[in-house]
């Protein structure tokens, strides 16, 4: 057969679906690889062909679209499972072609089992809610296109294993779940189960997401440098190890990049010749506020090093701050005999 533009296996689209539930999977060609959509391709005389490779097999085979009750079907650029089975797991390929053009891409599909409390190996999306921020909502994700607007599904929300029924501050409102005032106790996995009829059968769509309650932007502040500070002086003799911690608190800020760095005499440590190492550790509070510590270390400090300026810098979306460490050379204790001699006016 003639050459085909092969985009390979698109592992960025690791699609996971629950066993025994409907799944609609769009051909990734039109979403990520080609500059035109399915309608344009179709009207230009291009045909979309689907095939697959079963898990642990190398053989590409056509998809059987003649299964009982049309369990697997294709509609435009969507591959439908009504419903999925465990052994549908594999790599699926969609190929767009005519006599002069060919383009294809493969993607992995994993059919995942869940237990009756919705536990499964499914990778869960995380939805962050601001603590004590007023009403916030989560929406049952990825359910569009499964049933027509004339069908009124039943939506049941769960926290963990349990139906959300008169929870204090959590209210199911159809496809939405409203949190009146989000608290740390609202952290957990939330599942919506959408039940709808189709052709005399009942189908479920199960969608689980993790809710994480995080610091509110109302309470966010610029970075706070706890160390170095004015109360601690790093007094060293030449040859000793100099250790200066830079400890910075960052309020949680959605999509903010938190940065901490040292400068020595106004330069980054990499840009100067002294033998300096920097070790970083990060810890988080329950609301994802962040504390970063960078320890600047000089194994054998020289008297020159003790004259330098050591400044800790920190930056977040809320602003930038800096603080210099107080570093000085320890004055050696005078020898007793010399002191006495000086005291008696000896020359």
């Amino acid at each position: 057969s003639e050459r085909c533009d092969d985009w390979g296996l698109d592992t960025m689209r690791q699609i996971q679906v629950f066993e025994d539930e409907p799944a609609r999977i769009k051909c990734p060609l039109f979403e990520h690889f080609l500059k035109f959509n399915y309608s344009t391709a179709h009207s230009a005389g291009l045909t979309l062909i689907w095939y697959w490779t079963r898990q642990d097999r190398d053989l590409e085979e056509p998809i059987n679209f003649r299964l009982p009750e049309n369990r697997i079907s294709k509609e435009k650029d969507v591959l439908w499972f009504r419903p999925t089975l465990l052994n549908d797991t594999g790599n699926y390929t969609c190929m767009l072609r005519n006599t002069t053009y060919c383009s294809k891409v493969a993607f992995p599909l994993e059919v995942v089992q869940k237990d009756s409390c919705f536990n499964s190996p499914m990778k869960l999306p995380v939805h962050k809610l601001y603590i004590e921020y007023g009403i916030q909502r989560i929406t049952c994700p990825n359910v569009d296109g499964y049933f027509p607007s004339s069908v009124k599904p039943t939506i049941t929300w769960y926290m963990g294993c349990y139906k959300i029924q008169n929870f204090n501050n959590v209210i199911p409102e159809g496809m939405n779940l409203s949190f009146l005032i989000a608290l740390i106790s609202n952290n957990g996995n939330y599942t919506c189960v959408v039940t709808y009829p189709e052709n005399g059968r009942t189908f479920h769509l199960t969608r689980t997401l993790t809710v994480k309650v995080v610091g509110s932007p109302k309470n966010a502040v610029p970075p706070v440098i706890h160390s170095p500070n004015d109360h601690v002086v790093y007094e060293k003799e030449p040859g000793e190890e100099l250790l200066i911690p830079c400890t910075v608190y960052f309020s949680f800020l959605m999509d903010s990049r938190n940065e901490v760095w040292w400068t020595i005499d106004g330069k980054k440590p990499d840009d100067i010749t002294i033998d300096v190492t920097i070790n970083e550790s990060i810890s988080h509070s329950r609301t994802e506020d962040e504390t970063r510590t960078q320890i600047l270390s000089i194994k054998k400090v020289t008297s020159e090093d003790l004259k330098r300026s050591y400044v800790c810098h920190a930056r977040s979306a809320k602003g930038e701050v800096a603080k210099a460490a107080k570093v000085k050379q320890k004055v050696p204790a005078p020898r007793y005999t010399v002191e006495l001699a000086c005291g008696f006016g000896a020359t």
Partner: antibody, heavy 120, light 107 residues
Framework: QVQLVESGGGVVQPGRSLRLSCAAS????????IHWVRQAPGKGLEWVAV????????FYADSVKGRFTISRDNSKNTLYLQMNSLRVEDTAVYYC?????????????WGQGTLVTVSS | DIQMTQSPSSLSASVGDRVAITCRAS??????LNWYQQKPGKAPKLLIY???SLQNGVPSRFSGSGSRTDFTLTISSLQPEDFATYYC?????????FGQGTRLEIK
């Protein structure tokens, strides 16, 4: 302990109405969905209707749709079944049952039942 | 509606026997399957929920298995108090349905 007590059964003529009640105690009634299930003499169990914890959703078996109405009064911890246009085939023991609040929704507690006889 | 079919309809067995009752759904119901025991003149009692989870207080000789369309209730060693009628029930659909029941009698 959890208790469900049905009342309101009796003998009624075809075409007439009857209202059953189910009084709940020993648990937070407003936090649970409650069902009506019936059993004709010598026959199996037949699900009749369910009402969600807050009354927001109600579902019925095809055999009673349009004739029976399920309702609840959470302030009184009571469930109701209004049965209109009764038929001879509605003769049965009617049970109310609490649905445990987990996905597979088993009925973990049942009342003792109340007998409804539809006869001319 | 989802139809639930139990088999057998009735079963004669002796104390100490191992018995199995099967339940088949007209479509896949995942593990949304519960089993109940009912004795004459009494309300049903929950035995197994979610196809295989044993309800608190139910003896461990009762067990459930299966998923999708085929389910089994097994009693490993029949006791005199186990002679009763058993029902399966699906809660996958908003319109719940029961199997027609299996009557377990003493041989």
């Amino acid at each position: 302990q959890v208790q469900l007590v049905e009342s309101g059964g009796g003998v009624v003529q075809p075409g007439r109405s009857l209202r059953l009640s189910c009084a709940a105690s020993g648990f937070t009634f407003r936090n649970y969905g409650i069902h009506w299930v019936r059993q004709a003499p010598g026959k199996g169990l037949e699900w009749v209707a369910v009402i969600w914890y807050d009354g927001s959703n109600k579902f019925y078996a095809d055999s009673v749709k349009g004739r029976f109405t399920i309702s609840r009064d959470n302030s009184k911890n009571t469930l109701y079944l209004q049965m209109n246009s009764l038929r001879v085939e509605d003769t049965a023991v009617y049970y109310c049952a609490r649905e445990e609040g987990i996905a597979v929704a088993p009925f973990d507690y049942w009342g003792q039942g109340t007998l409804v006889t539809v006869s001319s | 509606d989802i139809q639930m079919t139990q088999s057998p309809s009735s079963l004669s067995a002796s104390v100490g026997d191992r018995v199995a009752i099967t339940c088949r759904a007209s479509q896949s119901i995942a593990s949304y399957l519960n089993w109940y025991q009912q004795k004459p003149g009494k309300a049903p009692k929950l035995l197994i929920y979610g196809a295989s989870s044993l309800q608190n207080g139910v003896p461990s000789r009762f067990s459930g298995s299966g998923s999708r369309t085929d389910f089994t209730l097994t009693i490993s060693s029949l006791q005199p108090e186990d002679f009763a009628t058993y029902y399966c029930q699906q809660s996958y659909s908003t319109e719940i349905t029961f199997g027609q029941g299996t009557r377990l009698e003493i041989k």
